[in-house]
């Protein structure tokens, strides 16, 4: 048999080999396609199938406008005047080339170290199903679930049966101050064998956030307190989303749930030590504050102030 690839909406003529050029002809066309459940023999007189397929005077079969449902097998059997039988067999596959792919909602800016949406690539009105691919600086991007992730969606038009493909690209750009990356998207058709078509490239800028600023504040100011007093330690780390705050004492992690505030009620000698907080941001990693010393006054000769990182300041900022 012969494989035929036909474009949806276009006419297709299948020749009945060996058929006399004009009537009278002894021939039979039958088809098994998406419109039939088994073999359908076409009436030579024509009829309600003519809008889909009908026999021309020369014995060929005309499909006036090929559709998805016309994919299948077409067979002609003809007997010439000498009684010799000739068979023709065609396997028809159909295709439709979609519009040029487009990147919708392209990002103008990405944030280094943070997963950012680059855009959504759309290919509309193709058949059969093709594939969308993303490229960065001309190289194929392979989703790894970490720095590069792709979310794909396929929809089929209820009336036409044509496909719409969507592919959303998320990347976590590296910092480093090099030139911003260039992204493009390509569509590769499932049929026929054709070169991929590409979108226009986009080049969002990459913003590099500075290091997380973690400040530790102590109340009462100074960090030197009388026994039985309450000390409040507050960790400030402005960022979105808010980071998780963990507490350290004398270099050891305190077994407490994450919280930006640490209360030390009714302090005693056991509470003395060096305190710091660690802010953990999902995209910037952990950052520790400068430490603060808490001292408990035990009498007139005892210490009168806490030392905070060797300075007498009540708050310390981490540059």
């Amino acid at each position: 048999g012969q494989n035929i690839t036909a474009r949806i909406g276009e006419p297709l003529v299948l020749k009945c080999k060996g058929a006399p050029k004009k009537p009278p002809q002894q021939l039979e066309w039958k088809l098994n396609t998406g419109r039939t459940e088994a073999w359908k023999v076409l009436s030579p007189q024509g009829g309600s199938w003519d809008s889909v397929a009908h026999v021309l005077p020369n014995g060929s079969l005309l499909l006036p406008a090929v559709g998805i449902q016309d994919e299948g097998t077409f067979r002609c059997r003809t007997t010439n005047r000498n009684g010799k039988e000739t068979k023709s067999n065609y396997r028809v596959r159909v295709y439709q080339i979609p519009g040029k792919p487009e990147i919708l909602d392209p990002a103008s800016e990405l944030t280094a170290g943070i997963p950012s949406k680059v855009g959504t690539c759309v290919s509309d009105g193709g058949y059969p199903l093709g594939t969308l691919s993303w490229h960065m600086d001309g190289k194929l991007l392979v989703p790894d679930g970490k720095g590069v992730s792709v979310k794909e969606q396929t929809r089929r038009h209820p009336d036409t049966g044509l496909f719409t493909l969507q592919s959303e690209l998320m990347v976590t750009p590296a910092g480093g101050g090099g030139p911003p990356p260039t992204f493009s998207c390509s569509f590769s058709p499932g049929l026929p064998r054709r070169r991929a078509s590409y979108t226009a490239p986009i080049q969002p800028s990459v913003w590099e956030p500075g290091p997380l600023e973690v400040r530790l504040l102590v109340e009462p100011e100074g960090g030197a307190v009388a026994p039985g007093e309450t000390v409040t330690l507050t960790c400030e780390a402005p960022a979105q989303p808010p980071p998780q705050i963990h507490w350290m004492k004398d270099g050891m992690s305190l077994p407490l749930p994450p919280s930006p505030v640490l209360l030390l009620p009714e302090v005693g000698p056991q509470d003395e030590g060096t305190y710091s907080c660690v802010a953990t941001h999902p995209n910037r990693g952990p950052q520790e504050s400068l430490p603060i010393s808490i001292s408990v006054e035990t009498g007139e000769d005892g210490p009168t102030a806490g030392s905070e990182g060797g300075s007498g300041l009540g708050t310390l900022a981490l540059a």
């Epitope: 009436s43 009829g47 199938w49 003519d50 809008s51």
Partner: antibody, heavy 119, light 107 residues
């Protein structure tokens, strides 16, 4: 909204002629096959004629072949049925319907026009 | 030519009844059968297309099924507005053929 409106029915003598019209609106007329169906008084439905969307191909049952001619004017969104050599058994309500090929069947019908063949 | 034998030719039923009408094709017509409803003095209205598909705006109590060359129209719970005549149509082969009709009357 799809609308089909028949006209041209009436009383005609046996052997006479009549031309029915069907005005179509609410859809792209030249995308569809069109059909005439009739119904004799108190009887069932009978297919009379079909025409493809271009007007190049026409189809009839033996009962009306060579007497009736279906045609269309896509520029005017109109379907016609020329009936010649009319007989008493042609007396019926004639309906215009959209479709007639395997992609549609008949999906919309007009309200019909009565043709009476009598002396 | 294909014959479409429709049965019964008439039936009496009450509101709420389940009603079944059958058409048998004399040869294979694939899925190419429609069902129509017709009320006195009105044009037919398509209920089911391609054997099993409900036409737009038709209540879901109507359904169509097919087994080989046997086609069935079912009304799951008859309503007062369903008393009418029902026709099947094969449109796979010319001449296109209607069934003889089934008149559904009030019991």
């Amino acid at each position: 909204e799809v609308q089909l409106v028949e006209s041209g029915g009436g009383l005609v003598q046996p052997g006479g002629s009549l031309r029915l019209s069907c005005a179509a609106s609410g859809f792209t007329f030249n995308n569809y096959w069109m059909t005439w169906v009739r119904q004799a008084p108190g009887k069932g439905l009978e297919w009379v004629a079909s025409i493809d969307n271009s007007g190049d191909n026409t189809y009839y049952p033996d009962s009306v072949k060579d007497r009736f001619t279906i045609s269309r004017d896509n520029a005017k969104n109109s379907l016609y049925l020329q009936m010649n050599s009319l007989r008493a058994e042609d007396t019926a309500v004639y309906y215009c319907a959209r479709g007639g090929d395997i992609t549609t069947g008949f999906d919309y019908w007009g309200q019909g026009t009565l043709v009476t063949v009598s002396s | 030519d294909i014959q479409m034998t429709q049965s019964p030719s008439s039936l009496s039923a009450s509101v709420g009844d389940r009603v079944t009408i059958t058409c048998r094709a004399s040869q294979d017509v694939g899925i190419y059968v429609n069902w129509f409803q017709q009320k006195p003095g009105k044009a037919p209205r398509r209920l089911i297309y391609r054997a099993t598909n409900l036409a737009d705006g038709v209540p879901s109590r109507f359904s169509g099924s097919r087994s080989g060359t046997d086609f069935t129209l079912t009304i799951s719970s008859l309503q007062p507005e369903d008393f009418a005549t029902y026709y099947c149509l094969e449109f796979d082969e010319h001449p296109l053929t209607f069934g003889g009709g089934t008149k559904v009357e009030i019991k």
